[in-house]
Interface confidence: medium
């Protein structure tokens, strides 16, 4: 289980002195600087128990593994649910603390209830301040049960929940109807996913038999030990005032753990520290009792004395939980409660024992979870103990679980169970990510998701040119930082793979999937300059440029022309994909716009230096279209066009332009200028006989205007092939009767 403890200071005379502290004993907990160690979170959870809004609570981080919540101004701030979240990845764990108001109408006899699947849970709310009204029970904020106020038994309202299942877990409350919810009794029900003494996906595995009130975790079979106890089975007491999975944490203040509630990962829940009891954890254990909430009884034998923090303290010559074992009986010494090895390694495990008669090599054996017994390959005999060494065959995942070292002599026997965790070396599930590239270097993010087990101790990046048979180059990197692969060849594909390792022998995982990363081309260095430009219409601009002459081939794939419209804050980019091009026509520009123009050479994705910019002003757009265009055939080679001037002209027309095209023809249209803008009629000559033509026209002021409607007309028949259309204008009033 994750080593995470939520401490609540219950000295409640002054809410301003109240604080909650979340302490993590996990390696690298709370760093928050990278994906390997997310930060500790400590917050009030208002989803179920809502309290009146007050000033925001203050969160203070003390080093990397501790966070404290303060700033409670009134007792109602304290009531409700608080949670601490710690651990990384799949080990991310939430620890929950439920706070009851000491002045509530109803108080829980016991706040945390941990029960097994299928058990009957009984929640008991003690009447503290009686009200003659019904009591309503809620589960996770939803009403689901009422009790008449006459139904109290011995001053308690009981809620029986038969055959509980994991979904029944959550926050329960008992409230007098029409009373403030802050006067409720709040409970936490934790339902283990298995029946008593079982764990695992199908609840097929047997729990190790947790001692001293430890609770077997239904997912991994580990004992979650009460505060003040440690070891695989919680068999070992910490020194007074200490807690954490390795007794590494110290209770704050001079009175040790008095007045503190300890909340641990589910399925443990919350309790007082070892040696303390009561709703505010301020009462010392009664004689003969010890442990968290003083729930354990000493029952010491053979002159042992009861210590309220650790249990029986045995006189010389005796040991055991109740001092029931004579020192003549052999005893396993200093066996680690938990060992970790990597998959497919062949570790050596030592087991030391003492006793009278003295244990010899053959009297010590090692038993695996599947029942296989290993005999020691050698033993080291010292005056006070014998240490047997066992060579373990290649480890498989099924070897994870509880192993047992057993010693047997004529004086008796002893055994010690310890947990072996077989860890799978990490294997990247994805290829590393390319962040940026240059012609001779690649910047890579090695941080990828992985299968198997952490923590990650080293990350190796292997790379070599694609399709190469040469040895891989390897670089060992910090997992949290991006890596720059240097001294590479330009425009070359490299195969790049990640290999992760975890601590311990055989911790190197298989290489992850390869990815192809290609270095960039050499950067183009030549700076072009703009030779000139001219406007070909209100929305068209022709641009020409040059490059300096240098020896050798041109490093470049083409040119990028950029037009910046500062008024509108818009950039137009035009790609000229030939490195030989020195001119380009830009169309679709906005008439009457002031553009800044430059050109630069590109090679692959890299841009060279930009030319000095030029400033270009496009003329404004032209006039509206001429109106009522009409065509009339005059002969086999002549058609007369008539029209009306455009309306709402912004200025005097300089000319008209007529477009002539053979209907259905594939050739380019012919444009004919009408240079006398006062004209409203013109004759187009030199047309082919019996041919259908399309005509449209537009006016020009500073720029060309919009096209008129298109009109169709056919020349008359039997004419000879003409040279091509020409035009003759005259005023519309003349010549229409010819």
């Amino acid at each position: 289980a994750v080593d995470l403890t939520l401490l609540a200071n219950l000295r409640l005379t002054d809410p301003q002195r109240f604080f909650l502290t979340c302490v993590s004993g996990e390696a690298g907990a709370g760093r928050g600087s990278d994906a390997w160690g997310p930060p500790l979170l400590l917050e009030k959870d208002d989803r179920i128990v809502r309290t009146p809004p007050g000033p925001p609570l203050r969160l203070a981080r003390n080093g990397s593994h501790q966070v404290t919540l303060r700033g409670f101004s009134k007792p109602s701030d304290l009531v409700g649910v608080f949670s601490c979240v710690g651990g990384a990845g799949a080990r991310r764990t939430r620890v929950i603390y439920v706070h009851n108001s000491p002045g509530a109408h109803l108080l829980p006899d016991k706040v945390t209830h941990t029960v097994n699947k299928g058990d009957t849970a009984v929640l008991s709310a003690r009447v503290h301040k009686e009200k003659q009204t019904d009591v309503i029970w809620k589960s996770n904020g939803s009403y689901f049960y009422t009790l008449d106020w006459h139904e109290a038994q011995d001053g308690r309202f009981l809620l029986q929940l038969p055959n509980v299942q994991p979904p029944s877990s959550g926050i329960y409350s008992a409230t007098y109807l029409e009373a403030s919810p802050l006067g409720s009794a709040f409970f936490r029900l934790i339902v283990r996913g298995c029946g008593a003494g079982r764990w695992g996906p199908g609840c097929t595995k047997e729990c190790p038999g947790c001692l001293h009130g430890g609770v077997c975790h239904d997912h991994d079979g580990e004992c979650v030990c009460p505060p003040g106890f440690t070891g695989t089975r919680c068999e070992q007491a910490c020194r007074e005032g200490r807690f954490g999975q390795s007794c590494q944490e110290q209770c704050p203040g001079i009175s040790g753990c008095r007045g503190l509630t300890f909340c641990l990962p589910d399925p443990y829940g919350c309790s007082c520290g070892s040696g303390w009891r009561g709703s505010q954890c301020q009462e010392a254990c009664a004689p003969g009792h010890f442990g968290a909430d003083c729930r354990l009884q000493c029952q010491c034998q053979n002159g042992g004395t009861c210590d309220r923090f650790s249990g029986c303290v045995c006189p010389s010559g005796w040991h055991g939980v109740h001092c029931e074992k004579s020192d003549r009986i052999p005893q396993i010494l200093n066996m680690a409660s938990e060992l970790e090895f990597n998959l497919e390694t062949m570790p050596r495990i030592n087991c030391a024992a003492a006793g009278n008669p003295f244990p010899v090599r053959g009297s010590i054996e090692l038993r695996k979870p599947d029942g296989t017994v290993l005999l020691s390959t050698k033993a080291i005999v010292e005056p006070e103990k014998t240490t047997a060494e066992f060579e373990v065959p290649r480890l498989v995942l099924a070897d994870s679980g509880f192993w047992e070292c057993r010693v047997s002599t004529s004086g008796g026997q002893d055994s010690r169970r310890f947990k072996v965790n077989v860890k799978v070396p990490p294997v990247p599930l994805a290829a590393p990510r390319l962040l940026t590239k240059q012609s001779r270097q690649l910047v890579v993010s090695p941080l990828v998701s992985f299968s198997g087990d952490g923590p990650i101790s080293t990350v190796r990046l292997h790379y070599r040119p694609q399709d190469s048979t040469m040895d891989w180059s390897t670089i060992v990197v910090d997992p949290s930082e991006n890596v720059t692969l240097m001294n590479l060849r330009p425009k070359t594909g490299y195969s790049v793979r990640v290999q992760l390792s975890r601590p311990g022998e055989g911790g190197e995982g298989a290489w992850g999937p390869p990815t192809l990363m290609t270095t960039d081309c050499p950067e183009p260095l030549l700076q072009p300059w703009l030779e000139g430009w001219h406007v070909e219409g209100t929305d068209r601009l022709r641009v020409s440029w040059s490059l300096p002459l240098v020896p050798g081939p041109l490093v470049g794939d083409g040119f990028l022309l950029r037009l910046w419209d500062g008024t509108r804050g818009q950039e137009r980019r035009e790609n000229v994909s030939s490195p030989q091009a020195r001119t380009a026509l830009l169309t679709g520009l906005t008439p009457g716009t002031h553009y800044q123009l430059d050109v630069q050479l590109y090679h692959c994705t890299l841009l060279g230096p930009a030319s000095p910019p030029a400033h270009v002003l496009l003329p404004p757009s032209g006039p509206p279209a001429p109106r009522h265009l009409h065509a009339q055939a005059l002969s086999d080679s002549e058609i007369q066009l008539t029209w009306k001037h455009p309306e709402a002209l912004p200025g005097p027309i300089s000319k008209y332009v007529v477009e002539v095209q053979v209907a259905g023809g594939a050739g380019d249209p012919l444009w004919i200028d009408v240079d006398r803008p006062e004209e409203t009629s013109t004759i187009i000559r030199g047309l082919n006989a019996s041919t259908r033509y399309l005509f449209r026209m537009r006016a020009s002021i500073q720029g060309l205007g919009d096209w008129s409607n298109t009109v169709e007309e056919s020349t008359l028949g039997n004419g000879l092939q003409a040279e091509g259309p020409v035009q003759e204008s005259r005023a519309a009033e003349e010549g229409l009767d010819q």
Partner: antibody
Framework: EVQLLESGGGLVQPGGSLRLSCAAS????????MEWVRQAPGKGLEWVSS????????YYADSVKGRFTISRDNSKNTLYLQMNSLRAEDTAVYYC???????????WGQGTLVTVSS | DIQMIQSPATLSLSPGERATLSCRAS??????LAWYQQKPGQAPRLLIY???NRATGIPARFSGSGSGTDFTLTISSLEPEDFAVYYC???????????FGGGTKVEIK
Amino acid sequence: EVQLLESGGGLVQPGGSLRLSCAASGFTFSRYGMEWVRQAPGKGLEWVSSIYPSGGWTYYADSVKGRFTISRDNSKNTLYLQMNSLRAEDTAVYYCARRGSGRYFDYWGQGTLVTVSS
Amino acid sequence: DIQMIQSPATLSLSPGERATLSCRASQSVSSYLAWYQQKPGQAPRLLIYDASNRATGIPARFSGSGSGTDFTLTISSLEPEDFAVYYCQQRSNWPPALTFGGGTKVEIK
């Protein structure tokens, strides 16, 4: 002696409204939950609505939810039932009852007849 | 919602005989059940609460039994004033709804 006296019944057209009252005496009215129960002619009993001692909590049968409103005035020792959008099927004798221990009806009034007809 | 089914609908007996009335709930109501007596033109009267407890002033010939889904009201020896309609009533713990059975009429044979 506990006494409950209903009033306010009568003939009303469908869609109309009526307000029933129940005057209580002989007990501390503000300490008890109160109920309305009705009985259609020739039929069985049907619970209509409950109100808790201070009036803060009320419950209704699905058949009247949204149309009927139960209320009380503890200073006047009186229980009320405001009936809106009345239907023919609301025709019944309406009893007010005191809720005793365990949410049973230990005292009943004599009832008032409500007839909904056009 | 919990349904309450009473049987029989009518029970024809003579004074002095034993009457056994049944009430069945569609799901368990624990022991949260009451019995009421109603005479023509009168309001109902509480006889039994919590399945087996006699209300104040109720004669000993009335007794209730049962829990869960099956309940019985027994009148050990019928008196002339006992001929009436009898209703059972449950109260559920959530939602706090109250349901009556359809009633059993005990008439003189």
